[in-house]
Interface confidence: low
């Protein structure tokens, strides 16, 4: 289930969720009207000060790079 | 019926402890988060802190951090609140509520609340 | 003090309408969910609406939630006398030190 995730045990849970695509602590794009946390807000406050899942942490991914065309 | 169950009054001196139980029952007690927030007499609500019984992880506002602690047992879906160093300002109402930490509802579900009186 | 500032106290007679204020910052309710409750004489706080402007199944439509900015307003139609209570408005704040923070609590008499 959701827990809290602080520290090194969030640069950890970030780098297996994002792989090579990366990810940044910053706001992340796309964020909707709808989300519990405040929209200016990185994932420090939404992830360590408060419970935080997956889908929460996929949302701090880099997006996905597009193909180098040939 | 969905509800948070507090325990009784408790009158302590100032320097002691005090712990307060919050037993909750018709829902799942590991999908909400318990806050607790006091109320002195006459006075407005204050947020103490949370806790995510799942995990057990908590988060204390500022002004009890070092004096309070929330703990929780999932086999009897109760949460726990332990003020330490008592003082006659910590004479209040103290309410544990539930609030999902999935998504935002605001806490919809409020203890009776606990009488706790310092004084010495 | 407050980090949230309503109004100490309201009044209208019954069947009226009135609002009450909320006024924070950018590090609480501009960015933030707003709560509502209302809390009657003697009893625990009770949710009225959440997310800004949600009620919660049982709440009359009488009662309304909106937010601007810095500021939120919970509106009451249809003044009835049970409606007597205290009002708190409540939401998160992001600044340094983070949590839930309540405002000071509005007093709302019935008059008549």
């Known amino acids: 289930g959701p827990e809290t995730l602080c520290g090194a045990e969030l640069v950890d849970a970030l780098q297996f969720v994002c792989g090579d695509r990366g990810f940044y602590f910053n706001k992340p794009t796309g964020y909707g009207s709808s989300s519990r946390r405040a929209p200016q807000t990185g994932i420090v406050d939404e992830c360590c000060f408060r419970s935080c899942d997956l889908r929460r942490l996929e949302m701090y991914c880099a997006p996905l790079k597009p193909a180098k065309s040939a | 019926q969905v509800q948070l169950v507090q325990s009784g009054a408790e009158v302590k001196k100032p320097g002691a402890s005090v712990k307060v139980s919050c037993k909750a029952s018709?829902?799942?007690?590991?999908?909400?988060?318990i806050n607790w927030v006091r109320q002195a007499t006459g006075q407005g609500l204050e947020w103490m802190g949370w806790?995510?019984?799942?995990?057990?992880?908590?988060g204390y506002a500022q002004k009890f951090q070092g004096r309070v602690t929330m703990t929780r047992n999932t086999s009897i879906s109760t949460a726990y609140m332990e003020l330490s160093s008592l003082r006659s300002e910590d004479t209040a109402v103290y309410y544990c509520?539930?609030?999902?930490?999935?998504?935002?509802?605001?806490?919809?579900?409020w203890g009776q609340g606990t009488t706790v009186t310092v004084s010495s | 003090q407050s980090v949230l500032t309503q109004p100490p106290s309201v009044s209208a007679a019954p069947g009226q309408k009135v609002t009450i204020s909320c006024s924070g910052s950018?590090?609480?309710?501009?960015?933030?969910?707003v709560s509502w409750y209302q809390q009657l004489p003697g009893t625990a706080p009770k949710l009225l609406i959440y997310?800004?402007?949600k009620r919660p199944s049982g709440i009359p439509d009488r009662f309304s939630g909106s937010k601007s900015g810095t500021s939120a307003t919970l509106g009451i139609t249809g003044l009835q006398t049970g409606d007597e209570a205290d009002y708190y408005c409540?939401?998160?704040?992001?600044?340094?030190?983070?949590?839930?923070?309540f405002g000071g609590g509005t007093k709302l008499t019935v008059l008549g």
């Open positions: 806790m995510n019984p799942n995990s057990g992880n908590t």
């Open positions: 950018s590090s609480n309710i501009e960015n933030n969910h």
């Open positions: 997310d800004n402007n």
């Open positions: 509520a539930r609030d999902p930490y999935y998504y935002y509802y605001g806490m919809d579900v």
């Open positions: 018709g829902y799942t007690f590991t999908s909400y988060d």
């Open positions: 409540e939401t998160w704040d992001t600044s340094l030190s983070a949590g839930r923070v």
